[in-house]
Each structure stands twice: as C-alpha cells, then as structure tokens.
Interface confidence: low
Amino acid sequence: TLNSVLNSNAIKNLPPPLGGAAGHPGSAVSAAPGILYPGGNKYQTIDNYQPYPCAEDEECGTDEYCASPTRGGDAGVQICLACRKRRKRCMRHAMCCPGNYCKNGICVSSDQNHFRGEIEETITESFGNDHSTLDGYSRRTTLSSKMYHTKGQEGSVCLRSSDCASGLCCARHFWSKICKPVLKEGQVCTKHRRKGSHGLEIFQRCYCGEGLSCRIQKDHHQASNSSRLHTCQRH
C-alpha cells in the first residue's frame, strides 16, 4: 500500500524468487509486442500488447502501475506493467492487483487483513461477541457504534480498490472514482494503446477478474487496429 489515491497497483520490478539473490528481480518484462508477464509458474503472452508509455500511475489502468520494465529499475523509459494477482510475490502493496495487498512478500486479499498490521474493522452486530475471528485474523467488533465502515459497494465513492468490496475495483467515473464490478469472462475490457488515452477515459472499466486477461476477441483479429474489440478471456 501501499498506496494512496488513484489507480492502483502493479509491479515495478519483480522480487527475487525465494532464496534468490537480493536485488535481482525474478524476471523482466519484455517491451516488445506480445509482452511477457509472470502469471503463476509460467509466462503468458498477451496478444498484440503494445507497451503503454507512462510518467504517472494515473496514466495506467486500474490493473497496472507505471514503472520501468528493466531489471535494474532505472527510471529511463517507463511503461504500464501488469499488477500481481493473489498469491503472487510482491514487495509492496502497490504491486498487488486492486483488492489485494502485499503481506510477507505475497499478494493477499485485502478482505482478510489490510495494510500495515492488523485491520480493525468497526462493525455493528446484533450478538454479543466482542471479538470474533475470521480467516485466522482477529477482528475487533464495536457493538456500541452507530456508524460502521464496510467496504464500498457498487457505486460508492472510493480512492483505491482496497476501499471497495470483493469483486469490485475503484475506477474513474467522470471526475470522481467509484466502486465498479471487476470484469467477467466475455465482458469488454480496455487495452490502452496510445499515450494520453487514459486521460480521456472518464468512464473507466475495471480490470479482468482472476484467471482472465484482456485480449483481442478472436473474431476481431482481422479488424482495423482502431476497431479491435478486447474482452476478458481465460489465460
């Protein structure tokens, strides 16, 4: 979290594998079309992906982060890099995809335990447990509170995706940001190609859900570049 406002989460340089030498990322991201990114134990290719140059995180999508793709992490050319999904290695909160955060070098769901130390959620319950345990994490319950804070529901104003409930991400809507549904298989997604295109996107879509990536729809391969339709597809 690492991390406060806006756009969220991605990988700057990959951490070394367990037991690996410090300072040497586990992999580098190719800047060529057909960009390789780590997805579990093997690399996966995103069809016809054009690296999107950026200077600020805000120029990248909600499932990306602006960073150098080089091993050394030199500033130089920066592009939008894919965030790390749940159970993948990380070094800081922003490397993890929206709805996750970095705990002990692994991206975990922010529904379980968010940010530094344990999350304390103030919630109202109708029964008398002062302390209940969920998923192995202590969750403090304040019965006397009239106000209670839950994760933002669809349409709620947010600043980043960890503020939204599971299955939602924080995305731009006009000049604000609200919780929107994470995209499902077959839904249209946005793959940015031109510098500046993010700035024009006042109705921002969420990223594709777990196990999905934003690719050109198969029957649109022959279409012109400008009209290619991207959808969330299984890896």
Partner: antibody, heavy 120, light 103 residues
C-alpha cells in the same frame, strides 16, 4: 498553507489514557491516508498506526496493537489517536503525518509533534 | 520484517564538502525508499521518495540513488543548514539514522 497541527499530549501515569488530535488544513484531508509516527527521547522514528481515507482500514504496530485506536473525522479534517493502558515505553514525541497521494509509503507532510510522557 | 541499516552512524564533514549516506535493506525493496531529514526539536522532513525523486521544495543538492537493497543519499555541497539526522525508510520501517555533524 498545507499543514497538520497537533494537540493533546501531556503527562500521564502508567495504565492511564490520553487522546491525541491532529487537524489538517490546506489540502483535501479525505484524500489521504494519515499516520502516527513516534520518537522516543534520543531514539529514531517508529511507525505507530495508519488509517485510510474512510476509516475502513486501520493498521497498528505490534507494540501498540490492542491498546491504541486510530480514528478520523473527515468533516472536521481531524485525526485522533486514543491511547489506553499507557506504558513507560510509550513516552515519546508523537507526530501525525500525511502519506503522499500516490502512496509509496512516503510521508510528505508532518505535524509539529506532541510530547507524551508516561511516568509515575 | 524489513531491517534498514544506515551507515555511517555519524558523519563529520565541513560545509562545501560532499556527503554520502548509505542505507541497506535486509530484503529487496525495489526502489520504494524514502529519505527524511530531522533537525533537533523539529519534525522530520521528506527529502526523497521512490529512492530518487526529490520532494517538493527540496534543493537540487540533495539526490538519491539505488534500488534493490542498497541506497544512497548524496548532498553535493553541504550547506550549514544541512547538518542534521537523516533517516531512510521503506513503508513503516525506518533506519536508525545517520547523524551528519560539522567537523
């Protein structure tokens, strides 16, 4: 002027309670994660607690977990730290600090600090 | 837990000299490192974030470099007001500080 102004420190006996306040001005308070960092006499900086913009997520260091409670009131541009069961080792200058908007864990605006002394 | 080790503990230099402060992380932290300056009786001030970016209002004589586990704060030509304690930090973890004193 962008600033954080603190109040609420003082002398308290071990086992006692104290509430620190931090009031923001010059920026949109509700856009930021805000933190408490402390510094014991002659020692270095120690992160204590942090809270997100809508109070939905709060973090605590192991040394204060279960004793301190962080909260905020965005309508009043205010941050609070309720400190209970205070110990001698909690004696320190306490700072509130704003995390940078696109957060990388860096605190760019700090309060002036308030001294908490726990002693019998 | 990340441990940040700063060296030297104390650095004695004269105005106009170049200061080089080191910070080593116990784990790989990419380039997400911050540097703070603190003078006696004052709150810390952010100098550098993301290892090499100067914070607003920080003079150009301050520069940061490094990534991975080894980081450096350089003050190209010391001014009298630069003598203070400097901390490196990654998220909530702070180094123990380097005291920069006038020789």
């Amino acid at each position: 002027e962008v600033q954080l102004v603190q109040s609420g420190g003082g002398l308290v006996q071990p086992g006692g309670s104290l509430r620190l306040s931090c009031t923001a001005s010059g920026f949109t308070f509700s856009n930021h994660w805000i933190h408490w960092v402390r510094q014991a006499p002659g020692k270095g900086l120690e992160w204590v607690s942090g809270i997100n913009w809508n109070s939905g997520s709060r973090g605590y260091s192991d040394s204060v977990k279960g004793r301190f409670t962080i909260s905020r009131d965005n309508a009043k541009n205010s941050l609070y730290l309720q400190m209970n069961s205070l110990r001698a080792e909690d004696t320190a200058v306490y700072y509130c600090a704003r995390e940078r908007p696109v957060a990388t864990g860096a605190f760019d605006i700090w309060g002036q600090g308030t001294t908490v002394t726990v002693s019998s | 837990e990340i441990v940040l080790t700063q060296s030297p503990a104390t650095l004695s230099l004269s105005p106009g000299e170049r200061a080089t402060l080191s910070c080593r992380a116990s784990q790989w932290v990419s380039s997400y490192l911050a540097w703070y300056q603190q003078k006696p009786g004052q709150a810390p001030r952010l100098l550098i974030y993301d290892a090499s970016n100067r914070a607003t209002g920080i003079p150009a004589r301050f520069s940061g470099s490094g990534s991975g586990t080894d980081f450096t704060l350089t003050i190209s030509s010391l001014e009298p007001e630069d003598f203070a304690v400097y901390y490196c930090a990654w998220q909530e973890f702070f180094g123990q500080g380097t005291k920069l004193e006038i020789k």
